[in-house]
């Protein structure tokens, strides 16, 4: 009922709570002397469903049969209408339409940890749209039944707040949930279990790792568990990996030896627990322990390469380069590299430790036979040294690889191909492909890159340190014993027309011809490997097509003669540069008038 209902009553039959699809009879009746003043026969009773009129009747009472009410709550209000006055509210009623509860399904109970409390969950089934009370019962030993009620409409979880103890772990407990509302009741199927079935241990805690004698091969993982835990599973992985290694252990009593860890690697460890071999469930995984394994001495050998440069008649510069060991080979933080340089005939040797660099340059006499050895050291020891005899890598012309080509292969890759040398190809022990950014000044500080290729290969894809729109000087070496032959080529992974043309810095007259000198185009404007320069000239103030001279690009060249100019004629000259993608805009214009005699 709603409101004070002083003037009358609204009654609902059979009930204010009805099953979906049922019919209700609603009666609105006025109390004595509560009708329209002087005009009791003019009483007009009106029944509203929410704000919509559904029935009216003249007199002291109104009967209405209502069907098709939707799930949920519907409000009915009865009002009195008298002549020349507003409608007066008499009384009202709410009707609750719903369904009886369905049988709760999939009842399951769990106790988190030996000290936790029993909590159960279930599926309610479809919404009843009515106030529904759930009662969860737990029956067990000593003829005892606990029950807990939940008065929340959407109840599908209850925690009893009681703790099952392991005094008799095989004792049976039975849980059942019953849903009750005004239209009926329904109980779940009983769920029977033992302490061991439902107790889910707490995850292990206080996880630690110890390495005996700072060795990765003597590693023990320690943790703490609840008292009844019988089984553990361990999972661990390098921090940068997505794949776990799994180990199952029984009766570990909080410790386990791990034998397959890699040195100098950060690992993540987690542990889970279970009370019984085949009963119950695994705990959640513990919080992660992150720990780094100790170093071990490096394995593997450094990949070493070198470059020789002539200084003068008695001296040469040797530049050594080596690649970092992989993480799995370094097995620790590399503290320094040890470089030993030895003259093989005289036995003179010099050793130096290099930190922070992977290259070393020294000057040695051009005479004698020289060898180097390079090794990497961490806190536990050194790698085996890589030994190299210093030789003239390009001396043996017959060992030079033939038909070397360099072609762009997708983004930032260059495919280098070659043919074996003319000399017995079977003599080749390995090829080395070397590349470095092309700098017109032949700058020795430019980083050197290389890769080794097996003797039966005739191609290599180079991708390390390759940038778009940069020209690389590429050399292919064929090595055989203490001899080497080489061939070189220029290549780029991506090219376009140069952004500018060469800058003419001087024009000089020499015996009836001129010598044009220019500045190289800045590397960042070359946009790949230059193939040609073009020198253009035409008579000043002439509309004729310019003449041109095309010069093949050579790294060191920055001047060229022209001998086809007429004396005492003023010419305008300019230059462009070309890559395989096209020609640059022209560089600066210079005027020149040849003073020599006419032919």
């Amino acid at each position: 009922k709603i409101d004070a209902c002083k003037r009358g009553d609204v009654t609902v039959k059979p009930s204010h709570v009805i099953l979906l699809g049922s019919t209700v009879n609603i009666t609105c009746s006025l109390k004595p002397r509560q009708g329209c003043f002087h005009y009791s026969r003019r009483n007009k009773l009106i029944l509203y469903k929410f704000d919509r009129r559904i029935n009216f009747h003249h007199g002291h009472s109104l009967n209405s049969q209502v069907t098709g009410l939707p799930l949920g709550t519907t409000l009915f209000v009865c009002k009195l209408a008298c002549i020349n006055s507003d409608e007066i509210q008499i009384c009202g009623a709410e009707i609750f339409v719903g369904v009886a509860p369905e049988q709760p399904q999939n009842l399951s109970c769990i106790q988190k940890g030996e000290q936790g409390t029993v909590a159960c969950t279930w599926e309610r089934g479809r919404d009843t749209h009515l106030y529904t009370e759930y009662t969860l019962q737990l029956s067990g030993p000593k003829n005892l039944t606990w029950q807990k009620q939940c008065k929340d409409i959407y109840c599908d979880y209850l925690d009893f707040g009681i703790n099952l103890t392991p005094e008799s772990p095989e004792s049976n407990f039975t849980a059942k949930v019953t849903a009750v509302n005004s239209l009926g009741s329904s109980s779940s199927l009983p769920s029977t279990f033992t302490f061991l079935d439902i107790v889910r241990p707490l995850p292990p805690w206080d996880i630690r790792i110890k390495f005996q004698k700072a060795s990765v091969s003597r590693c023990t993982l320690y943790w703490r568990d609840e008292g009844l835990v019988l089984l553990n599973r361990l999972r661990y992985r390098p921090s940068n990996s997505r794949l776990w290694n799994m180990v199952n252990v029984t009766k570990a009593k909080g410790r386990h030896d791990l034998l397959d860890l890699k040195p100098f690697t950060e690992y993540e460890f987690q542990i889970s627990s279970k009370l019984h071999l085949y009963k119950g469930s695994w705990s959640d995984w513990s919080e992660s322990l992150r720990a780094q394994t100790p170093e071990e001495e490096p394995t593997g050998m450094l990949d070493v390469w070198y470059m020789k440069r002539h200084i003068d008649y008695s001296r040469q510069q040797i530049s050594l380069f080596w690649k970092n060991l992989s993480v799995s080979e370094a097995r620790g933080k590399i503290l320094h590299y040890q470089v030993t340089l030895q003259e093989l005939t005289g036995g003179k040797a010099m050793t130096q430790n290099i930190t922070g660099h992977t290259s070393w340059t020294t000057v040695i006499p051009r005479t004698g036979n020289w060898a180097v050895a390079v090794s990497a050291a961490n806190s536990k020891g050194s790698s085996l040294p890589t030994r190299i005899n210093i030789m003239n890598l390009c001396e043996a012309g017959l060992l030079a690889p033939r038909q070397v080509s360099a072609n762009s292969e997708g983004m930032d890759n260059i495919l280098v191909t070659w043919q074996p040398p003319r000399k017995d190809p079977s003599a080749v022990q390995e090829y080395v492909v070397e590349w470095r950014e092309l700098h017109p000044g032949g700058d020795t500080q430019v980083p050197l890159n290389w890769l080794r290729s097996r003797p039966y290969n005739v191609s290599a894809l180079i991708s390390e340190n390759i940038k778009s729109y940069i020209c690389y000087e590429i050399r292919v070496y064929a090595l055989s014993g203490d001899q080497g032959g080489c061939s070189s080529i220029l290549g780029n992974s991506k090219h376009k027309a140069p952004l500018s043309g060469p800058h003419i810095n001087a024009i000089t007259e020499e015996k009836g011809s001129i010598l044009i000198s220019w500045n190289s185009i800045p590397v960042q404007e070359q946009m790949g490997c230059l193939l040609h320069y073009r020198i253009y000239w035409k008579e000043r103030d002439s509309n004729s097509q310019p003449q041109l001279c095309e010069i093949p690009y050579r790294v060191s060249q920055n001047s060229h003669p022209i001998n086809s100019l007429q004396p005492r004629v003023t010419y305008v000259l300019w230059m462009t540069a070309l890559t395989a993608a096209g020609e640059s805009s022209h560089g600066n214009e210079r005027e020149f008038c040849l003073q020599g005699k006419a032919n």
């Epitope: 000290q115 000593k142 029950q147 103890t165």
Partner: nanobody, 129 residues
Framework: QVQLVESGGGLVQAGGSLKLSCAAS????????MGWFRQAPGKEREFVAV????????AYVDSVKGRFTVSRDNAKNTVYLQMNSLKPEDAAVYFC??????????????????????WGQGTQVTVSS
């Protein structure tokens, strides 16, 4: 110091009903679990039912489950035991008891007399066949 006074006992026919009340005074009623025990002549005191402080958790001995209902009204400091479908073997002196709060409630907590600090004098229930 909590005082407990039971009432509502008496003689009833088998199959009949009784409602026992237990009024508490002298303590914070809502902080105690309230239990009902019974003792027949020559037998040990037996647990019947308990209602926890919140009122939504109860426990019963299986022999009364479905017939007896324990409830409490914290505003009135009273606990009730509604007994329906009484049997001759239900005849006994019924005691009300107040149990101290515990840090952890085990399955058998509040089902033994030693779990309770305060006891009433008891009320006699007789069931005739």
């Amino acid at each position: 110091q909590v005082q407990l006074v039971e009432s509502g006992g008496g003689l009833v026919q088998a199959g009949g009903s009784l409602k026992l009340s237990c009024a508490a005074s002298g303590g914070t009623f809502s902080s105690y679990a309230m239990g009902w025990f019974r003792q027949a002549p020559g037998k040990e005191r037996e647990f019947v039912a308990v209602i926890m402080r919140s009122g939504d958790t109860t426990a019963y001995v299986d022999s009364v489950k479905g017939r007896f209902t324990v409830s409490r009204d914290n505003a009135k400091n009273t606990v009730y035991l509604q007994m329906n479908s009484l049997k001759p073997e239900d005849a006994a002196v019924y005691f009300c008891a107040a149990g101290r709060p515990v840090t952890r409630t085990y399955y058998h907590t509040y089902t033994y007399p030693h779990d309770y600090d305060y006891w009433g004098q008891g009320t006699q229930v007789t069931v005739s066949s």
